[in-house]
């Protein structure tokens, strides 16, 4: 009988194409249950039905059909806690990173029809159910409204709202992007009695104005109150209104702690502790002092009390308070003590237990690694994530601490579940953590699973990306390595993406992808098939990502190294890494490039202009070019103020423009969207002007009416095609 001809698997596989990336052919799915009780959740199915699941009875049924969704073109939904109503969201219209407006319809599940009468106005800026029953709070034209029931007339809570001037219940631009990272600034108390909200007064903030070309005869001008470094900031006030009788008392203002109110300050977050206790966090404009203030409702005077002995101060002596943001407290069942992540005496972020004062805090975790997020505190357990396991900063595992035990015992829930496939997890917990979902992002194919909150046993696989696994079978994927390199007393973690038939004895072009912003992390054990995967797979380019000083989760000494001197060590460490990669022997020294977006565009620009001759070419997409052009909250957190008596000198020294002459010996591609609300086009305009003034040749591309993400399909295609051509030309790779 004839023997079968053996074909090595490698020959049957194809390389990735740019088209694969642009079409999202190899995108993965995750599954996050929308928890509605201890053992029940909702999920939107592939065909857009909203399905109810009960883990214990194993029942599942369609709670809202796709035809009902389709009848109002709904793309999202929200079930009221009493399960009588669902809001349907349609006409989604993106504003900034988190914010959008939409049209909302209320569907009555009992009688199977939409609620008529007192329909909601449109477009609404934010809408949410109360945590109990079916009260609705929403923001329309910068004012907050309340409905006791969906069919009731609305009660207007605030009257001060004014476009681009005063925002109630929603953040202004800078708070949305740099402080809250949400589209909302209102919070219901757990029993739905009180509603807390923030008023942002932007009346004195300078306006950034840019053209939006559209397709009309005249462009329109977008105006955004946007405080750049050193400018006037929003004035914030926090109010609480009793929603049972909102007309009787009116919103009450919550006082700012005196030590904060004595100079410019920020509100940073609000956490309801119980139905009559609330916790507010405040931050000085010089962001090294944060105050957590616990306030109680007093029935006798119907007033909010924030006693001084319930103020807890967190201060950094080596940099700024917190990580990227100041952490939020996770309160115990006693509604008095809480768990919080902040730096320990060795400068590593760890979980601390605060009972009375921060000085008497009990450290719960410790070591030369960092606790990253507290997911849930229950009667007997605390669930958190960290990068402790095996000493890899770019991993995330979920741990459980049994707080009932003395001393508390720690268990890694995820470390050994699917060790090769999964090293980077997040979690989603049901009420009281009776059940939880784990979502693994890599390094292998992402997988989502359901677990018992008592035993940690896996109950069910929710999504394992089987289709993706099958479609990747015939693809030549690059090899990914995560390792560390040492230089002097410093350790830098890097990720290297190697072409499929990588041979150490050969020479390859190298592309450095950089972000490098303070408290960011690029070297993560996650799965991705993206542009750089394609460059390695098809074009034979070695890609490297390096986490230099200023990046996160490796202690404050490493993190705070960049404090008040952005643009120095981030660049230096990329250069150090490139030299180390050259020493490895497989890099073609004549073909090294660097690229980055946003903060990465800033670092790539400075690296190209470092005068080292290491780079042949590079790309900066939407780069910051001067910290004076960027948002106050961000710039000042890391750089202080651009004033003579503070840090003006380094603000001036750290610009890309100051290094214009040094671009003469590199090929530079500068790219920016003209409607970038975040890193304004101004940044690239100033780089271009400085290069022209210095008579330095460079390439540039703008994307009309595109924002910081350059997200429109056509623009993305053009952008990545353009960058690919540029790189291939730089590396002398044939088309």
């Amino acid at each position: 009988r004839p023997s079968r001809v053996y074909k090595p698997e490698g020959n049957t596989k194809r390389a990735l194409t740019l088209k694969d990336i642009l079409n999202g052919t190899f995108s993965y799915k995750t599954y996050f249950p929308n928890w509605i009780s201890e053992q029940e959740y909702l999920h939107q199915s592939e065909d857009d039905n909203i399905v109810f699941y009960n883990i214990e009875t194993r029942e599942s049924y369609i709670i809202l059909s796709n035809s009902t969704m389709k009848s109002v073109n709904a793309t999202d939904y929200g079930l009221s806690p009493d399960r009588q109503f669902v809001y349907l969201e349609s006409d989604y219209s993106k504003l900034w990173r988190y914010s959008y407006t939409a049209t909302y319809y209320i569907y009555d599940l009992q009688n199977g029809e939409f609620v008529r009468g007192y329909e909601l106005p449109r477009p609404i800026q934010y809408l949410c159910w109360s945590p109990v029953g079916s009260k609705l709070a929403y923001v329309y034209q910068n004012n907050i409204y309340l409905k006791q029931r969906p069919g009731d007339p609305p009660f207007q809570i605030t009257y001060t709202g004014r476009e681009n001037r005063i925002f109630n219940g929603i953040p202004d631009w800078v708070y949305e992007e740099e402080m809250l990272a949400t589209k909302y600034a209102l919070w219901w108390s757990p029993d739905g009695k009180f509603l807390a909200y923030v008023e942002f007064n932007d009346s004195d903030i300078p306006i950034i104005a840019y053209s939006y070309y559209g397709d009309g005869q005249y462009p329109r001008t977008i105006n955004i109150p946007y405080p750049k470094a050193g400018a006037k900031n929003p004035v914030v006030r926090v109010f609480i209104v009793d929603t049972t009788y909102p007309h009787h008392v009116g919103p009450m203002e919550v006082p700012v702690p005196e030590m904060i109110a004595s100079s410019d300050y920020y509100f940073s977050w609000l956490t309801w502790v119980s139905s009559e206790r609330v916790c507010l966090q405040w931050l000085k404009r010089v962001q090294n002092v944060s105050v957590l203030s616990i306030c109680d409702f007093r029935e006798d005077w119907h007033a909010w009390e924030c006693p001084k002995n319930q103020e807890h101060v967190e201060e950094s002596r080596t940099g700024w308070a917190g990580g990227f943001f100041v952490s939020t407290p996770a309160f115990s069942q006693d509604a008095t003590s809480y768990y919080k992540i902040f730096s320990d005496k060795d400068g590593y972020k760890h979980i601390h237990y605060i009972k009375d004062t921060v000085e008497n805090a009990i450290q719960i975790t410790s070591g030369k690694w960092e606790a990253i997020y507290i997911f849930r505190v229950t009667q007997d357990s605390l669930f958190y994530s960290s990068n402790e396991f095996e000493g890899y900063p770019g991993r995330r595992n979920i741990y459980r601490i049994s707080i009932g035990n003395s001393p508390p015992s720690k268990k890694c829930v995820t470390c050994h579940l699917r060790k090769e496939r999964c090293q980077y997890y997040t979690a989603s917990f049901s009420y009281k953590a009776k059940y939880y979902a784990l979502v693994c992002y890599g390094p292998g194919l992402p997988i989502s699973t359901l677990h018992d909150g008592r035993t940690d046993q896996e109950i069910q696989v929710l999504e394992e990306n089987k289709e993706l696994e099958n479609s990747l079978r015939n693809i030549q994927l690059p090899k990914v390595e995560i390792k560390k390199l040492k230089d002097g007393g410093l350790t830098f973690w890097y990720k290297m993406i190697l072409p499929p038939q990588f041979d150490r004895s050969k020479k390859y072009p190298l592309l450095i992808q950089v972000y490098g912003g303070p408290c960011s992390q690029s070297v993560k054990s996650v799965f991705a098939v993206n542009w750089i995967t394609y460059l390695a797979s098809k074009e034979g380019i070695v890609i490297a990502l390096v986490d230099g000083r200023g990046t996160a989760f490796q202690g404050d000494k490493f993190l705070h190294a960049v404090y008040r001197k952005l643009g120095v060590y981030e660049v230096e460490d990329q250069l150090t890494a490139v030299r180390k990669f050259i020493e490895m022997g497989f890099i073609d020294e004549e073909r090294i490039a660097i690229w980055g977006w946003s903060y990465g565009g800033y670092v790539s620009s400075l690296a190209l202009a470092s005068g080292t001759g290491l780079f042949k070419c590079g790309i900066a997409v939407a780069p910051v070019s001067s910290w004076e052009y960027y948002a106050s909250i961000y710039s000042e957190r890391f750089m202080g103020l651009p004033t003579k008596d503070d840090n003006l000198e380094h603000y001036k020294n750290s610009t890309v423009m100051a290094r214009a002459e040094y671009f003469r010996n590199v090929d530079y591609l500068l790219i920016h969207g003209t409607a970038d609300d975040n890193v304004h086009f101004q940044n690239s305009a100033q780089i271009a002007k400085a290069l022209v003034n210095a008579q330095v040749d460079f390439q540039a591309m703008w994307y009309s009416d595109q924002n910081h993400g350059i997200l429109s399909g056509r623009s993305q295609n053009h952008l990545y095609t353009h960058m690919t051509h540029f790189l291939k030309q730089c590396f002398s790779l044939s088309d």
């Epitope: 006030r237 109010f239 009116g250 009450m252 006082p255 005196e258 007033a303 909010w304 924030c306």
Partner: nanobody
Framework: EVQLVESGGGLVQPGGSLRLSCAAS??????????IGWVRRAPGKEEELVAR????????RYADSVKGRFTISCDTSKNTAYLQMNSLRAEDTAVYYC????????????WGQGTTVTVSS
């Protein structure tokens, strides 16, 4: 030193009106940490907080017994709070005290010396 000084009390017929004033010194009534209240004491009756205001927000609260008849307000430029009393009844007769409470030190109440209101025909 914090001081609250009331004025405006007196004798008035049922159905009449009076306006009580409370001038504050030693703290700022427009601070969000400050609440000003009017408390009345009458022989044989329990002390009653008839109205309170947080001047920073304008949030007010009234005892059911005076709702719709009394209005509490403040003039932050004068650092003074007022109680406008309309449709007065015999049962409104009492000594009216201005009280100040600060959120940071809630348990402590600053008191004025009191002003007497007598409603009688």
């Amino acid at each position: 030193e914090v001081q609250l000084v009331e004025s405006g009390g007196g004798l008035v017929q049922p159905g009449g009106s009076l306006r009580l004033s409370c001038a504050a010194s030693g703290f700022n009534i427009k601070d969000s940490s400050t609440y000003i209240g009017w408390v009345r004491r009458a022989p044989g009756k329990e002390e009653e907080l008839v109205a309170r205001i947080q001047c920073s927000s304008g949030s007010t609260r009234y005892a059911d017994s005076v709702k719709g008849r009394f209005t509490i307000s403040c003039d932050t430029s004068k650092n003074t709070a007022y109680l406008q009393m309309n449709s007065l009844r015999a049962e409104d007769t009492a000594v009216y005290y201005c009280a100040g409470r600060q959120s940071y030190n809630y348990g402590y109440i600053y008191w004025g010396q009191g002003t007497t209101v007598t409603v009688s025909s």
